[in-house]
């Protein structure tokens, strides 16, 4: 339940936050789950715990595994799990999918690319930025705080962007890199009142208890880049992120497609390990832009597994 995936490259720094919510200043104990061995807090160790953070300075492939964190209190301990994978550095330029953070979209009006996970590190500006492994040069590129700004964005600016920075720990420096894809939205076109293609209004979706289920909210908003357009899921009228059920997640980053020249977005709602109580929830697919908001409601019903009799 309280689990989070983290990944990094060997010989780079990796810092992981305990997925279980505590508050600053509380004691957090870390363990290597496979052996139940306590992670030391002394900073002279290559891997050490520092409050809510677990630090690999630097990381090694052998560090991969599940780490347990326990936020301690005399009356209520809270346990979380960090699933850490450390990969070998690639010799070629390609960044494999498993090392990629969520894709971001930009346009001429908004071309910020944030450096993922940087807030966990003790770093100083400026960041170094690379596109498809080439260092970015020229006045169009500006590294500002923890993000990259691209002036006069063009379609050719789409690609994989890597930020590189130095984490400092007690005077020692460690390199960190993080990569995410950037897509460019076309600026010309027009906008319409949102049209939801899926799901149908008041659709009943059959799901199997204990299995995973996906719901796709898909809507079109006009032609070309939309100044303001979004699709999202709500549960019982609450945003997914606020609802706080870890089994139910929206797919990070909205997929943009152009169907018959129309600008369309879809957002996939992933429900892991469907439970009885999920059938009682109201799932709303919301599509909104400057013209207004359209809502289609979906409910789940139990699909009875087909009996197999001899």
């Amino acid at each position: 339940k309280f689990s989070k995936q983290s990944w990094g490259l060997e010989n780079e720094a990796l810092i992981v936050r305990c997925p279980r919510q505590g508050k600053p200043s509380y004691t957090v104990d870390w363990y290597y789950s496979q052996t139940n061995k306590s992670i030391p807090t002394q900073e002279r160790n290559r891997v050490f715990a520092s409050g809510q953070l677990l630090k690999f300075l630097p990381a090694a492939v052998a560090d991969s595994g599940i780490y347990t964190c326990i936020v301690r209190s005399p009356t209520f301990n809270r346990t979380g799990y960090a699933n850490v994978t450390i990969y070998k550095k690639q010799s070629d330029c390609n960044v494999p999918d498993y090392l990629m953070y969520s894709t971001v979209s930009g346009s001429e009006k908004n071309s910020k690319i944030y450096c993922p996970t940087i807030d966990l590190y003790n770093w100083t500006a400026p960041l170094e930025w690379f596109k498809n492994c080439q260092a970015l040069q020229g006045s169009r590129y500006r590294a500002h705080k923890s993000f990259l700004v691209i002036d006069n964005v063009m379609t050719e600016d789409a690609g994989d962007y890597t930020c590189k920075f130095i984490h400092n720990e007690n005077g020692a420096n460690y390199s960190v890199t993080a990569t995410r894809s950037f897509t460019v939205k076309d600026e010309q076109g027009f906008s319409l009142f949102p049209v939801i293609g899926a799901p149908a209004q008041n659709e009943i979706k059959e799901v199997e208890i204990g299995k995973n289920a996906n719901l796709t909210c898909s809507a079109c908003f006009g032609k070309g880049t939309q100044f303001l357009a979004a699709v999202l899921w709500q549960l019982n009228g609450t945003k997914i992120t606020d609802f706080g059920e870890p089994r139910i997640q929206q797919e990070e980053g909205q997929n943009q497609s152009f169907s018959n020249g129309l600008a369309c977005l879809d957002m996939v709602l992933r429900i892991a390990d469907v439970k009885e109580e999920d059938l009682l929830l109201q799932y709303d697919c919301l599509a909104l832009n400057l013209h207004g908001l359209r809502r289609h409601t979906v409910r789940l019903s139990r699909k009875n597994p087909i009996d197999h009799h001899s």
Epitope: F2, R20, Q21, G22, K23, S25, Y26, T27, V71, R72, S73, P74, T75, F76, R78, T238, D242, F243, G244, E245, P246, E277
Partner: antibody, heavy 117, light 111 residues
Framework: DVQLQQSGPGLVKPSQSLSLTCTVT?????????WNWIRQFPGNKLEWMGY???????TYNPSLKSRFSITRDTSKNQFFLQLNSVTTEDTATYYC??????????WGQGTSVTVSS | DIVLTQSPASLAVSLGQRATISCRAS??????????MHWYQQKPGQPPKLLIY???NLESGVPARFSGSGSGTDFTLNINPMEEEDAATYYC?????????FGSGTKLEIK
């Protein structure tokens, strides 16, 4: 942000049961946290009554003996107080509150309950 | 149960001056390097609001003029400088063991 909205009767007769509802928005009560009931007597004294945690496990103040229980409805994201055999001593303002860890971080608006015939 | 005794019961402080409120526990609320004492502010008609947790940690969004200190059985809440909006009743609460208990409150007024 987590928000807690309380509802329930303002007047209860002695020996009857008091039932109050706390509806949570902005967070699922099954995700994490502990969900408390606290009451404040007319002299302003505060008393922690107990909590139900994200897993449904309950912890009660022994001073309330077996008169008190907390339950929940996860489909509505609500948790409930039930106090049986009330007396005039149970006249108070009742609050629901959430605990991230130890302290009461978010509070409901409070429900004033008078026990009187 | 751990009994928390607050003093004074009421206090009047001039704007810009320091207000000091004490909370004494009937037994230690500290263990493993932490003191499990928290402070709340309550204004008339409103629920209490968390100010400080673990004796000295400022809750997010609370002004820095509020500070807490102490360990074991003796704890202090300081407000410096006192501002008009700080007129309220202040409560301490422990979470060292069940049941959690609150102090009797200190009413802070402007002199």
């Amino acid at each position: 942000d987590v928000q807690l909205q309380q509802s329930g009767p303002g007047l209860v007769k002695p020996s009857q049961s008091l039932s109050l509802t706390c509806t949570v928005t902005g967070y699922s009560i099954t995700s994490d946290y502990a969900w408390n009931w606290i009451r404040q007597f007319p002299g302003n004294k505060l008393e922690w009554m107990g909590y139900i945690d994200y897993s449904g496990s309950t912890t009660y103040n022994p001073s309330l003996k077996s008169r008190f229980s907390i339950t929940r409805d996860t489909s509505k994201n609500q948790f409930f107080l039930q106090l049986n055999s009330v007396t005039t001593e149970d006249t108070a303002t009742y609050y629901c509150a959430s605990t991230v860890i130890d302290s009461m971080d978010y509070w409901g608006q409070g429900t004033s309950v008078t026990v009187s015939s | 149960d751990i009994v928390l005794t607050q003093s004074p019961a009421s206090l009047a402080v001039s704007l810009g001056q320091r207000a000091t409120i004490s909370c004494r526990a009937s037994k230690s609320v500290s263990t493993s390097g932490h003191s499990y004492m928290h402070w709340y502010q309550q204004k008339p008609g409103q629920p209490p609001k968390l100010l400080i947790y673990l004796a000295s940690n400022l809750e997010s969004g609370v002004p820095a003029r509020f500070s807490g200190s102490g360990s074991g059985t003796d704890f202090t809440l300081n407000i410096n400088p006192m501002e008009e909006e700080d007129a309220a009743t202040y409560y301490c609460q422990h979470s060292r063991e069940f049941p959690f208990t609150f102090g009797s409150g200190t009413k802070l007024e402007i002199k």
